[in-house]
């Protein structure tokens, strides 16, 4: 007969693994008793249980609780046990000594690995603002056994690099995304993802990105000159600008207070039916936490007694 | 020598719960899977269940609902407990050991007769 | 549930005869058979396990065969004290379940 176990048993974390050890004998053969025992390389062994025929299963002090025999269907030659909520300091070589009758003993070995899943943590780089070079957009960090793998999943552009570093039972993997801020990466997601043979599935982790910036300001109404003339009524200047964080959007008259009558509500500024009184320079000032813009037009109402054309100066400063 | 001895009341009323008790002496509990198995009067054999010494457990899925077995290790002793029980209950219950490297009740109790009637 | 039905169901034969009792599965169960040995008023007893394996201390007259779903218990020379009902019961899958019972009585 021989012995029959695996060369390496794998289990996660806080799972039971199964230590098998199967006697493959002749018709007639009996298995009389099954010692398994942990035998690290220098140092001595540890015995885990003994099986015996007659008086059943004994279960070293240190392992307590911890190894059984499985349920059954059972093998009459299998001399496998179970041992429950794996911990790291479980993994190492074990051996199994089989007595049989009349073949008498046989040994094997083992080697338990325990895989330790990782637990990724994403953690933001600086706020990230157009006009800045190269800039740290997240790091992700997983550590587990073995080295998990941490990659990057994205649309955005931008270089990644990862650094390792090793524990005594495991190791840590953080792998960092470097990008160019630009508005356009505003919303886009920067997913970390990790691999680990511990993981049913790769565990994802995502990121929006937050770019700040602020357009330049403009204003519209002015288009059609011609409309700008006494007596209009619904006339309204717009301030034209985005940013991230969102603008906040302020009026004011450059030669003076803004008229009496006028509207300020946010981006626009409505006008009561036109007098000459409301001819002069509106600036409209944009501005967030980023940055600040302004814009300024000429508002000339005309009179349409007069023949004299309107005339409408556009500055915009920033 | 191990030997198995099923202790309980060999009278039950109808709907009330049946409760037995197997000691192991001559050896321990510990290390084996114990079952419990019933015959009523000249018919077959019927399994009820197992439990492991640690405490795991198995049922017939027909009985299970109203089964329980359970084991105290410092008494050497396991348990069973069949509620809302009917005449059709009415059997000589054993207990038994697995083997342990193999399937099979290598040692019995002699068995106890219980019968449910009002 | 696995059904298991042993025939015969009664079996009258002489002291020295050779008895052979039939269990089948109504699906496969490897080799996780048993047989037990019963006698009026007393518990069973195990004769075989894992479908061919002698329990220790068993006359060897007795012994077992098969696997799949046919199973055989064969007694070489009945002896006096083999008089009693027979038992077949599998393992492979729960609920473990047990033979009807073959009753070798004497002739």
């Known amino acids: 007969g021989e012995l029959e176990t695996s060369d390496v048993v794998t289990v996660v974390l806080g799972q039971d693994a199964k230590l098998p050890c199967f006697y493959r004998g002749d018709s007639g053969e009996q298995v009389g008793q099954v010692a398994w025992a942990r035998v690290d390389a220098g140092e001595g062994a540890q015995e885990l249980a003994l099986l015996h025929s007659k008086y059943g299963l004994h279960v070293s002090p240190a392992y307590e609780g911890r190894v059984e025999q499985p349920p059954p269907p059972r093998n009459p030659l299998d001399g496998s046990v179970l041992l429950r909520n794996a911990v790291q300091a479980d993994e190492g070589e074990y051996e199994c000594r089989v007595s049989t009758f009349p073949a008498g003993s046989f040994q094997a070995r083992l080697r338990l690995r325990v895989l330790v899943p990782p637990l990724p943590s994403l953690n933001p780089g600086p706020a990230l603002e157009e006009g800045q070079g190269l800039t740290l957009a997240a790091s992700c960090t997983a550590e587990g056994s073995p080295a998990p793998s941490v990659t990057w999943d994205t649309e955005v552009k931008g270089t990644t690099s990862s650094r390792s570093f090793k524990h005594s039972r495991s190791a840590a993997v953080t792998s960092e995304f470097h990008l160019v801020p630009s508005r356009s990466m505003n919303g886009q997601p920067l997913t970390c993802v990790v691999s680990h043979p511990g993981l049913l599935q790769d565990q994802r982790i995502t990121h929006i990105l937050h770019v700040s910036f602020l357009a330049e300001a403009s204003v519209r109404g002015l288009e059609d000159q011609n409309l700008w003339h006494i007596g209009r009524e619904g006339a309204m200047l717009k301030c034209l600008s985005e940013g991230q964080p969102p603008p906040s959007y302020n009026w004011t008259r450059l030669d003076g207070p803004l008229p009496s009558g006028v509207r300020v509500d946010g981006d626009t500024l409505g006008f009561p039916p036109l007098t000459t009184e409301h001819s002069g320079i509106y600036v409209c000032h944009v501005s967030n936490e980023f940055s600040s813009r302004d814009s300024q037009v000429t508002v000339d109402v005309l009179d349409p007694q007069e023949d004299s054309g309107k005339q409408v100066d556009l500055v915009s400063a920033s | 020598q191990v030997q198995l001895q099923e202790s309980g009341p060999g009278l039950v009323k109808p709907s009330e719960t049946l409760s037995l008790t197997c000691t192991v002496s001559g050896g321990s509990i510990s290390g084996y899977y114990w079952s419990w198995i019933r015959q009523p009067p000249g018919k077959g054999l019927e399994w009820i269940g197992y439990?492991?010494?640690?405490?795991?457990?198995n049922y017939n899925p027909s009985l299970k609902s109203r089964v329980t077995i359970s084991v105290d290790t410092s008494k050497n002793q396991f348990s069973l407990k069949l509620s809302s029980v009917t005449a059709a209950d009415t059997a000589v219950y054993y207990c038994?050991?697995?083997?342990?490297?193999?399937?099979?009740?290598?040692?019995w109790g002699q068995g106890t007769l219980v019968t449910v009637s009002s | 549930d696995i059904q298991l039905t042993q025939s015969p169901s009664f079996l009258s034969a002489s002291v020295g005869d050779r008895v052979t009792i039939t269990c089948r599965a109504s699906?496969?169960?490897?080799?996780?058979l048993a047989w037990y040995q019963q006698k009026p008023g007393k518990a069973p007893k195990l004769l075989i396990y894992?479908?061919?394996t002698l329990q220790s201390g068993v006359p060897s007259r007795f012994s077992g065969s098969g696997s799949g779903t046919e199973f055989t218990l064969t007694i070489s020379s009945l002896q006096p004290e083999d008089f009693a009902t027979y038992y077949c019961q599998q393992f492979n899958s729960y609920p473990w379940t047990f033979g009807q019972g073959t009753k070798v009585e004497i002739k």
């Open positions: 038994a050991r697995l083997g342990i490297f193999f399937d099979a009740f290598d040692i």
């Open positions: 699906q496969g169960i490897s080799s996780y």
């Open positions: 439990i492991y010494y640690s405490g795991s457990t």
């Open positions: 894992a479908a061919s």
